[in-house]
Amino acid sequence: DAEFRHDSGYEVHHQKLVFFAEDVGSNKGAIIGLMVGGVVIA
């Protein structure tokens, strides 16, 4: 059987992303999210 390992040498990078609330709604201020591995998760 094939053995799958998680330490394959790939790093999962994360980056803080900031959006303006008015771009996605009508509020003021900034919205801070987190992108992990190319996906915005928060």
Epitope: Q15, K16, L17, V18, F20, E22, D23, V24, K28
Partner: nanobody, 124 residues
């Protein structure tokens, strides 16, 4: 095609102030989110701050928060970067940049319009 042109750079003493301007032409100013970046010699271009399309919201990098202020004038199609309490480490080429609505404001790849840059040198 949208064109951005910065002005106002120069040599200033540490602790001093400078105001950069960025004139926007060739596009609908109110639909473009504007930001400022800077690049010091031998370093990557870094985010300084941004202002929303309406001008109601701003966001700044921690390194300039409380010292730099971004504003925009819709009548003049111009964005300003007011820089106070300048430090040696603020020495860089400063770029204004424009991005489509809905994109992240703090990363370079969101911005598809760039000015040519203006040099700011802080001397102690």
């Amino acid at each position: 095609q949208v064109k951005l042109e910065e002005s106002g750079g120069g040599l200033v003493q540490a602790g001093g102030s400078l105001r950069l301007s960025c004139a926007v032409s060739g596009g609908t100013f109110s639909s473009i989110g504007m930001g400022w970046f800077r690049q010091a010699p031998g370093k990557e271009r870094e985010f300084v701050g941004a202002i929303s399309r309406s001008g109601d919201s701003t966001y700044y990098a921690d390194s300039v928060k409380g010292r730099f202020t971004i504003s925009r004038d819709g009548a003049k199609n111009t964005v300003y970067l007011q820089m106070n309490s300048l430090k040696d480490e603020d020495t860089a080429v400063y770029y204004c940049a424009g991005r489509p609505a809905g994109t992240a404001i703090n990363i370079r790849r969101s911005y598809n319009y760039w000015g040519q840059g203006t040099q700011v040198t802080v001397s102690s």
